[in-house]
Amino acid sequence: LQDPCSNCPAGTFCDNNRNQICSPCPPNSFSSAGGQRTCDICRQCKGVFRTRKECSSTSNAECDCTPGFHCLGAGCSMCEQDCKQGQELTKKGCKDCCFGTFNDQKRGICRPWTNCSLDGKSVLVNGTKERDVVCGPSPADLSPGASSVTPPAPAREPGHSPQ
């Protein structure tokens, strides 16, 4: 014998108090599949959470985070504080990257600068807290007369001889 509740579409529930007829979900609730005996309460996007998609009778609300925070977890179950580039989030809040590390995003951790010498290359552009180093060609690749990354020595003043 077919369950009469199976005829109830999404957006309704099978109301046992009313001879199992299909009743619309009450305000602030939804059912995303047919044949439901109850409707689920809509998610509320409160505080740091903002509404990305309103709840409807057939689908739950979707939240994201207010500016200055980003989503974490399935369905944006958490909002985590953004930091500035050149920082990482620690237990004590946003802290600058230590020397030799960088972070070019508002989230995540500071990562070590690339070690150019491991690839036999030279440093073309120094790293900062916000940017990785840029590796240049290996010293062997620099043909005679090619420009070097080493800045030229300052010109000596006339009349001064080398020591």
Epitope: K46, G47, V48, F49, L72, E80, Q81, L89
Partner: nanobody, 121 residues
């Protein structure tokens, strides 16, 4: 039952001061941080300041540094947002929330309803 209740909002002249309170009940206050957020008419909600369970401050908005401070009285289950040198752009509804940690909010954290601050020029 868990409750966060903001109070202290008012109409104040630019350059003036206000102290907002966030009174908590129904949970172990000492275990939670308290964060203040604000929403101005027609603008996105923004974080203002947060105080950790141990009393450390986190500024979410650079625009309030040097003007707003935050403190907590665990005996009274209350956090205070002291606002000085108020500007018209500080006009907003201010609300408090109670995360475990100032850097991370969960969808089941507690929130108050808000208190209106209006700064006239």
């Amino acid at each position: 039952q868990v409750q966060l209740q903001e109070s202290g909002g008012a109409l104040v002249q630019a350059g003036g001061s206000l102290r907002l309170s966030c009174a908590a009940s129904g949970f172990t206050f000492d275990d939670y941080a308290i964060g203040w957020f604000r929403q101005a008419p027609g603008k996105e909600r923004e974080g203002v300041l947060c105080i950790s369970s141990s009393g450390g401050s986190t500024y979410y908005a650079d625009s309030v540094k040097g003007r707003f401070t935050i403190s907590r009285d665990n005996a009274k289950n209350t956090v205070y947002l002291q606002m000085t040198n108020l500007k018209p752009e500080d006009t907003a509804v201010y609300l408090c929330g109670a995360p475990r940690d100032c850097s991370r909010y969960s969808s089941d954290d507690y929130w108050g309803q808000g208190t209106q601050v209006t700064v006239s020029s």
